[in-house]
């Protein structure tokens, strides 16, 4: 069972989905699950979901966390359920920021 790139694992996982891209669904199916945190207009925006395309996940998941965004990825059914991405602040918070879950 191969694609143009035979090294890609065709296995799909069920993931928790939270955020604007999820529509009315609270779950999605993909090759990787993710949990992300970004700062948008002073808000901490948390999102969870799927990468359906291997290259997309590979690129995003290997990006090191920055002060404004962090993504954690995993492979396994519902593996992102209890994952909360953390910004690399070592316990410090940015002034004027609030926690905000996109629903």
């Amino acid at each position: 069972m191969e694609d143009e790139k035979p090294k890609v694992n065709p296995k799909l996982y069920m993931c928790v989905c939270e955020g604007l891209s999820c529509g009315n669904e609270d779950h999605c199916e993909g090759q990787q699950c993710f949990s992300s945190l970004s700062i948008n207009d002073g808000f901490h925006v948390y999102q969870k979901g799927c990468f359906q395309v291997y290259e997309q996940g590979k690129m995003t998941c290997k990006t090191p966390p920055s002060p404004g965004q962090a993504v954690e990825c995993c492979q396994g059914d519902w593996c992102n359920r209890n994952i909360t991405a953390q910004l690399p602040t070592k316990g410090k918070s940015f002034p004027g920021t609030q926690n905000f879950h996109l629903e």
Epitope: E29, Q52, V53
Partner: antibody
Framework: QVQLQESGPGLVKPSQTLSLTCTVS??????????WSWIRQHPGKGLEWIGY???????YYNPSLKSRVTISVDTSKNQFSLYLTSVTAADTAVYHC?????????WGQGTLVTVSS | SYELTQPPSASGTPGQKVTISCSGS????????VNWYQQLPGTAPKLLIY???QRPSGVPDRFSGSKSGTSASLAISGLQSEDEADYYC???????????FGGGTKVTVL
């Protein structure tokens, strides 16, 4: 309300290529978020997964059928298609299209394809 | 042949509880979640249970799923005449690299 509808010839001659199309209504394939699969059911028997596709072109097939199967997506028509080459009587079945790659949460009604000369 | 093994038939009277088993191996049920499908006579299959025990919206809570080791079960409590159908289990198989189905169980309401 998302619906799937299969279409294609109900009769295919042995050694020829089976071609079926699944038209998706109520949702855009190109918006992403879902895989699209083909599953078949031999008369009076159980289900057999054929393969899945994503709108960007990624496809994976059942290893037992891989050498004969192609699944393609036409986002402009909001359709995805199944091509099965070198068919024999053993390929006679009801062919279903479905939303999902592993968990099939929406199914087309299915179309019976008979392989006979 | 099917990678997942189900009994060909099961039956019960209205109101009874019926349980359908689905036996697999370490490469499918043992390491992946199980989905169940209901196929009423003359219709397409319908997702009944996903990820071992999750019910899609609209599925009555009379239907429940469970998994233990390399086996899974579908329970129908308070059996009703409209539950007469074929039921299929399915899971990803890591060895075959694909989705495998059980052979199906025909449930008859007596």
């Amino acid at each position: 309300q998302v619906q799937l509808q299969e279409s294609g010839p109900g009769l295919v001659k042995p050694s020829q290529t089976l071609s079926l199309t699944c038209t998706v209504s109520g949702a855009s394939i190109s918006s992403g978020g879902y895989y699209w699969s083909w599953i078949r059911q031999h008369p009076g028997k159980g289900l057999e997964w054929i393969g899945y596709s994503y709108y960007s072109g990624s496809t994976y097939y059942n290893p037992s059928l891989k050498s004969r199967v192609t699944i393609s997506v036409d986002t402009s028509k909001n359709q995805f298609s199944l091509y099965l080459t070198s068919v024999t009587a053993a390929d006679t079945a009801v062919y279903h299209c479905a939303r999902g790659g592993v968990r099939f949460d929406l199914w087309g009604q299915g179309t019976l394809v008979t392989v006979s000369s | 042949s099917y990678e997942l093994t189900q009994p060909p038939s099961a039956s019960g009277t209205p109101g009874q509880k019926v349980t359908i088993s689905c036996s697999g191996s370490s490469s499918n049920i043992g390491s992946n979640t199980v989905n169940w499908y209901q196929q009423l006579p003359g219709t397409a299959p319908k997702l009944l249970i996903y990820s071992n025990n999750q019910r899609p919206s609209g599925v009555p809570d009379r239907f429940s799923g469970s998994k233990s080791g390399t086996s899974a079960s579908l329970a129908i409590s308070g059996l009703q005449s409209e539950d007469e159908a074929d039921y299929y289990c399915a899971a990803w198989d890591d060895s075959l690299n694909g989705v495998v189905f059980g052979g199906g169980t025909k449930v008859t309401v007596l």
